[in-house]
């Protein structure tokens, strides 16, 4: 059960990150042209 919940949490976090950064992989809160 704990393993299942951990897996569910991990997948949820990954989905959230993917939504945030978008399919292009560029996070609109961070600069990508220089190391700001």
């Amino acid at each position: 059960m704990k393993r299942f919940l951990f897996l569910l949490l991990t997948i949820s976090l990954l989905v959230m990150v993917q939504i945030q950064t978008g399919l292009s992989g560029q996070n609109d809160t961070s600069q990508t042209s220089s190391p700001s």
Partner: antibody, heavy 114, light 111 residues
Framework: EVQLEESGGGLVQPGGSMKLSCVAS????????MNWVRQSPEKGLEWVAQ??????????HYAESVKGRFTIARDDSKSSVYLQMNNLRAEDTGIYYC?????WGQGTTLTVSS | DIVMTQTPLTLSVTIGQPASISCKSS???????????LNWVLQRPGQSPKRLIY???KLDSGVPDRFTGSGSGTDFTLKISRVEAEDLGVYYC????????FGAGTKLELK
């Protein structure tokens, strides 16, 4: 939608001063290092100055050709960046863009001529 | 200071044909965080510049997949698989690893 609007350009005599302004919207301005880049037929695109973040103590850096004459500043509360230009020379003539490089505006034109 | 050398300075192409632009930096653009800050910018006639590619190979939003960026260290390439009319203009490579330096530009024009 990202927008960068530069203003303040115009005609100035050699040795004179001018202040350029830029207002940004559509991206988290305070998270971005901001630059002024200029363009002339002679030199193409040329980086002029950069100002970093509050967390970098608003560190500033300049191209050798403008060091001691130009000053870059920012106001995160207004999403604005400025370029104070003193002791202007004919070779400072060009279109000035305020840009994080990720995004670009239309630029403002400075002409230094007598 | 880092110097960016672009070749060729002019590239005459036929619509539908491929195109390739080279950009070489005088020192490595690999930053201490493991990222390489090499961008490609296009300036269409009468317009302001617009970034197409960042971090060597990542396409900005809305950029067609006929554009490909590649390279590492000091040698970089921009390729267009099939040139379209809207691709004409001047292409600049610009490094962001140590302030910013632009290449001289490559004018993509019709043959």
């Amino acid at each position: 939608e990202v927008q960068l609007e530069e203003s303040g350009g115009g005609l100035v005599q050699p040795g004179g001063s001018m202040k350029l302004s830029c207002v940004a919207s559509g991206f988290p301005f305070s998270n971005y290092w901001m630059n002024w880049v200029r363009q002339s037929p002679e030199k193409g695109l040329e980086w002029v100055a950069q100002i970093r973040l509050k967390s970098n103590n608003y560190a500033t850096h300049y191209a050798e050709s403008v060091k001691g004459r130009f000053t870059i500043a920012r106001d995160d509360s207004k999403s604005s960046v400025y370029l104070q230009m003193n002791n202007l020379r004919a070779e400072d003539t060009g279109i000035y863009y305020c840009t994080p490089i990720d995004y670009w505006g239309q630029g403002t034109t400075l002409t230094v001529s007598s | 200071d880092i110097v960016m050398t672009q070749t060729p300075l002019t590239l005459s192409v036929t619509i539908g044909q491929p195109a390739s632009i080279s950009c070489k930096s005088s020192q490595s653009l690999l930053y201490s965080n493991g990222k390489t800050y090499l961008n490609w910018v296009l300036q269409r006639p009468g317009q302001s510049p617009k970034r197409l590619i960042y971090l060597v190979s990542k396409l900005d939003s809305g950029v067609p997949d006929r554009f490909t960026g590649s390279g590492s260290g000091t040698d970089f390439t921009l390729k267009i698989s099939r040139v379209e009319a809207e691709d004409l203009g001047v292409y600049y490579c610009v490094q962001g690893s140590h302030f910013h330096t632009f290449g001289a530009g490559t004018k993509l024009e019709l043959k």
